[in-house]
């Protein structure tokens, strides 16, 4: 028969012959022959291959380096890589999460719109009229100005995006 020019799914063409790919978690030791199936071997400890493959070497699991602020979020298997995330208060600098940076704080006048996670930074927003933030924080939202009226007080000093209003007693009308 004519040698094949293309192979089925989960096969590869080598020297005019279709051989089975190695399953995830295994590496190629030797191509198949007319008489022998493809030789595959399981990946070793701390190694993985996540696809049907013909790789002769497994990939090393990612190392979550604590010196870079990283920790293991999900331990790798022979078929999956280790997933790293950042320590509390830090987030990844990239999608691959190869290093971490400290969460950004929102300056006075800005509040936290979205609290940072291990993979995303703090998102800040300017405090709108009626709200303020007087601290630099990675957690604090903009707070509403105090309502003097509900306390039976009057505004003595107007609020800003960085300061609360100052309430005071109402002037008593003299008889």
């Amino acid at each position: 028969p004519e040698p094949p020019t293309a192979c089925r799914e989960k096969q590869y063409l080598i020297n005019s012959q279709c051989c089975s790919l190695c399953q995830p978690g295994q590496k190629l030791v030797s191509d198949c022959t007319e008489f022998t199936e493809t030789e595959c071997l399981p990946c070793g400890e701390s190694e993985f291959l996540d696809t049907w493959n013909r790789e002769t070497h497994c990939h090393q699991h990612k190392y979550c380096d604590p010196n870079l602020g990283l920790r293991v979020q999900q331990k790798g298997t022979s078929e999956t890589d280790t997933i790293c995330t950042c320590e509390e208060g830090w987030h990844c600098t990239s999608e691959a999460c190869e290093s971490c940076v400290l969460h950004r704080s929102c300056s006075p006048g800005f509040g936290v719109k979205q609290i940072a996670t291990g993979v995303s930074d703090t998102i800040c927003e300017p405090c709108p009229v009626g709200f303020f933030s007087n601290v630099s924080s990675a957690f604090e939202k903009c707070h509403p100005w105090t309502s003097c009226e509900t306390k039976d007080l009057v505004v003595q000093q107007a609020g800003t995006n960085k300061t609360d209003v100052v309430c005071g007693p109402q002037d008593r009308l003299r008889a």
């Epitope: 020297n15 030797s30 191509d31 198949c32 022959t33 007319e34 008489f35 022998t36 199936e37 030789e39």
Partner: antibody
Framework: QVQLVESGGGVVQPGRSLRLSCAAS????????MHWVRQAPGKGLEWVAV????????YYADSVKGRFTISRDNSKNTLYLQMNSLRAEDTAVYYC??????????WGQGTMVTVSS | EIVLTQSPGTLSLSPGERATLSCQAS???????LAWYQQKPGQAPRLLIY???SRNNGIPDRFSGSGSGTDFTLTISRLEPEDFAVYYC??????????FGGGTKVEIK
């Protein structure tokens, strides 16, 4: 460890039959093709026969075609060579060997077959 | 059928010397499917080189294979006492039959 052990050799008269066995251990026998290779006293290596991993494909050297039959029992991890109508020129050490795309990577220690009247 | 011719038939050398063994094929060996085996007296052959130039697992790097098409060479860079043996080439690209060369005996001078 990976091992092949031949047995069944001996002295036999011309025209008679003999069955050689090759017991495999230490690897997944059912995934590998297997060969028989022989070596006459003081001579070189001569390939005899091959069988595919599942036993469907078999090839023979012209010198043994029609007289020798290669077979296997994967449930017993054993390869066989049925030798009929033996001749003096079949006298040799018979080796079984594992088939890979690297050649014959594992060999047994051999079993001696002597065809003599 | 591919016929393999090995030369020389015998090579007389001293330990430490370089050994060059030749294997010539009667027609081109596809995909360089050529192997070299070492055989010592009373022992089974041992696979040294496959694919004309790749060393098998555990084979010392003083053994090297080269060549393509019809001309192949096994080189032992510095002979050790345990290297004195018979060496066979074999093609496994065109079968049946899988053919062996006649062998080269490397003996102590």
């Amino acid at each position: 460890q990976v091992q092949l052990v031949e047995s069944g050799g001996g002295v036999v008269q011309p025209g008679r039959s003999l069955r050689l066995s090759c017991a495999a251990s230490g690897f997944t026998f059912e995934k590998y093709g297997m060969h028989w290779v022989r070596q006459a006293p003081g001579k070189g290596l001569e390939w005899v026969a091959v069988i595919s991993y599942e036993g469907t494909s078999k090839y023979y050297a012209d010198s043994v075609k029609g007289r020798f039959t290669i077979s296997r029992d994967n449930s017993k991890n054993t390869l066989y060579l049925q030798m009929n109508s033996l001749r003096a020129e079949d006298t040799a050490v018979y080796y079984c060997a594992r088939d890979t795309s690297r050649g014959h990577d594992i060999w047994g220690q051999g079993t001696m077959v002597t065809v003599s009247s | 059928e591919i016929v393999l011719t090995q030369s020389p038939g015998t090579l007389s050398l001293s330990p430490g010397e370089r050994a060059t063994l030749s294997c010539q094929a009667s027609q081109s060996v596809s995909y360089n499917y050529l192997a070299w085996y070492q055989q010592k007296p009373g022992q089974a052959p041992r696979l040294l080189i496959y694919g004309a130039s790749s060393r098998n697992n555990g084979i010392p790097d003083r053994f090297s294979g080269s060549g393509s098409g019809t001309d192949f060479t096994l080189t032992i860079s510095r002979l050790e006492p345990e290297d004195f043996a018979v060496y066979y080439c074999q093609q496994y690209s065109d079968y049946p039959p899988f053919t062996f060369g006649g062998g080269t005996k490397v003996e102590i001078k």
